[in-house]
């Protein structure tokens, strides 16, 4: 168990032309908050897939009001870290999504209006207990700077938070068979806690909560002696016909050794003989070092002087992956701005620009807003090969002549009907619901038993009982 921590350093306009318009205005102050979603492994799942490692929301930042005429600065941020607790082992490789949300502090009925300003995503390798890793991600014209780390919650330690440590019982040394816990010299690796009642003489465990029996003993707690006098074979007597008890499968059955290791039985358990490059009880840990030349395609290997410390491959341009084994599709980084077509010619990238744009990356907008008018207080923005209007709140369309629909964001819960009103919106609740936005079911369960889902529950409004 442990905690993933994310510290947002800044959120503001990225470098280059086309600075984004401030998300807040004098008429409509707003504040930011952030959401982080974590998934194990290097998954390339859709943003909507579950945050299997966990998710967190920040507090809201200070209220910000744009100074008229001033460029959008870095926006004021919420205090504190975003913390995502994880219950199980830290996976080492993970995918993240960080969303920047804007909360408009206008006169919305039933609560604040929220909109997603930017979403960044990435895939990273990270060992628990390591230093803060710094990152910069761009989403459109916005830039997010942040740091992150994973740390174990005591008594867990290690790069995956799977080893347990306890304070030493004796001042000088750890108990029999228990190693000191680096980097906590005053602590010892804790003995595994076997299943409650597991025989201390005839049972043992390799993972918390299990009870494995020594030869000659059986039963869920290893308290039943195996009688072999009238059995058909030393390993597998028939309990139905002879009254013999069948011991569990042999410790090497199913070969518990990973990565091509070979298994041999020992009096207490089993032993894996690991192939070169792997070690650990089940050969599950890669012992590859820089001496083994793990970096392909001319990658530079750093660190990893001994099998317990990880190596890192610094890849040459055009390659990626933990071992520089993947050729980068450089066009997947979308280097051509403003809808330009990307061509990877091997030795170089070329951008074929759309009409109205020029430059090596189509970054120069040849258009301008001269003589273009945006209605209802909208402002003209260059881009896209034609002028575009950034409209004031409540208006939309190409020239800001259309009234925006305040009901478009489904602001009424539990199937409530939304009605646009001169001051914002009004929710007419479905029978059985009340509240400014219909968020409170009057009778949430149809019977006195729990947990029954309220009537009319829809996939959009799932129920969580704690």
């Amino acid at each position: 168990a442990g905690v993933f921590e994310l510290q947002i350093h800044s959120f503001g306009p990225g470098p280059g032309p086309g600075a984004p318009r401030s998300p807040c205005s004098a008429r409509l102050p707003c504040r930011l908050f952030f959401r982080v979603c974590l998934k194990p492994g290097l998954s390339e799942e859709a943003a909507e897939s579950p945050c299997a490692l966990g998710a967190a929301l920040s507090a809201r930042g200070p209220v910000y009001t744009e100074q008229p005429g001033a460029p959008a600065p870095d926006l004021p941020l919420p205090d504190g870290l975003l913390q995502v607790p994880f219950r199980d082992a830290w996976p080492g490789t993970f995918s993240f999504i960080i969303e920047t949300w804007r909360e408009e502090l206008g006169d919305q009925i039933g609560g604040p209006a929220w909109s997603l300003l930017a979403r960044v995503a990435g895939r990273r390798r990270l060992a628990a207990g390591g230093p803060w890793a710094r990152d910069i991600q761009r989403a459109g014209a916005w830039e997010l700077r942040f740091s992150y780390r994973a740390r174990c919650e005591p008594p867990a330690v290690g790069t995956a938070c799977t080893r347990l440590c306890r304070p030493r019982s004796a001042p000088s040394r750890c108990g029999p068979g228990l190693r000191p816990c680096a980097p906590l010299e005053d602590e010892c690796e804790a003995p595994l806690v076997c299943r409650a009642g597991c025989s201390p003489e005839h049972g043992f465990c390799e993972q918390p909560g299990e009870c494995r029996c020594l030869e000659g003993w059986t039963g869920p707690l290893c308290t039943v002696p195996v009688s072999t006098s009238s059995c058909l074979s030393p390993r597998g007597p028939s309990s139905a016909t002879t009254g013999c008890l069948v011991p569990g499968p042999g410790p090497c059955d199913g070969n518990p050794c990973a990565n091509g290791g070979s298994c041999s039985e020992t009096p207490r358990s089993f032993e894996c003989t690991c192939p070169r490059g792997f070690y650990g009880l089940r050969c599950e840990v890669s012992g590859v070092t820089c001496a083994d030349g793990p970096c392909f395609n001319g990658g530079l290997c750093v660190g990893g002087a001994d099998p317990d410390s990880a190596y890192i491959c610094h890849c040459p341009p055009g390659f990626q992956g933990s071992n520089c084994e993947k050729r980068v599709d450089r066009c997947s980084l979308q280097p051509c701005r403003n809808g330009g077509l990307c061509l990877d010619l091997g030795h170089a990238l070329r951008c074929r620009c759309r009409a109205g744009f020029a430059g090596p990356r189509c970054e120069h907008d040849l258009d301008d807003c001269a003589g273009r008018a945006c209605a209802n207080g909208g402002t003209c923005v260059e881009g896209g090969g034609a002028h575009r209007c950034s409209c004031a709140l409540g208006f939309g369309g190409r020239d800001c002549r259309e009234r925006a629909d305040p009901c478009a964001a489904r602001p009424c819960a539990h199937g409530g009907r939304c009605y646009a009103h001169f001051s914002g919106l009004v929710c007419a609740c479905a029978p059985g619901y009340m509240g400014a936005r219909c968020e409170f079911p009057v009778h949430p369960d149809g019977a006195s038993a729990l947990p029954a889902a309220p009537p009319g529950l829809r996939p959009g409004d799932p129920q969580r009982y704690l």
Partner: nanobody, 117 residues
Framework: EVQLVESGGGLVQPGGSLTLSCAAS????????MAWYRQAPGKKRELVAG???????DYIDSVKGRFTISRDNAKNSVYLQMNSLRAEDTAVYYC???????????WGQGTLVTVSS
């Protein structure tokens, strides 16, 4: 996932007062519409009072003027101040949260309020 923990229940005489607290973790209560429900033995669970994200409040008729729901963003908690308690207010009181960002609803485990002389 939002977690809700209620406290403050207990035995009180008719006409007495109690304040229930609901502490939320893993989400700021300012993002949540919060409510108190109650379930008397053998009866359906019913809404008692609710507070939306904008601070507007709702009460069922039988508690209007006696109960007050409030929220403290700094303590990440919601409260139900119950005055002039009656025997018919005896029930298990549950904290409820509606999270707008995900449109999930969450429940606490409940705290028992007994009004008896």
């Amino acid at each position: 996932e939002v977690q809700l923990v209620e406290s403050g229940g207990g035995l009180v005489q008719p006409g007495g007062s109690l304040t229930l607290s609901c502490a939320a973790s893993r989400s700021s209560v300012s993002f949540l519409s919060m409510a108190w429900y109650r379930q008397a033995p053998g009866k359906k669970r019913e809404l008692v009072a609710g507070i939306s994200t904008d601070g507007s409040t709702d009460y069922i008729d039988s508690v209007k003027g006696r109960f007050t729901i409030s929220r403290d963003n700094a303590k990440n908690s919601v409260y139900l101040q119950m005055n002039s308690l009656r025997a018919e207010d005896t029930a298990v009181y549950y904290c409820y949260a509606y999270r707008w960002l995900t449109r999930y609803t969450y429940w606490g485990q409940g705290t028992l309020v007994t009004v008896s002389s």
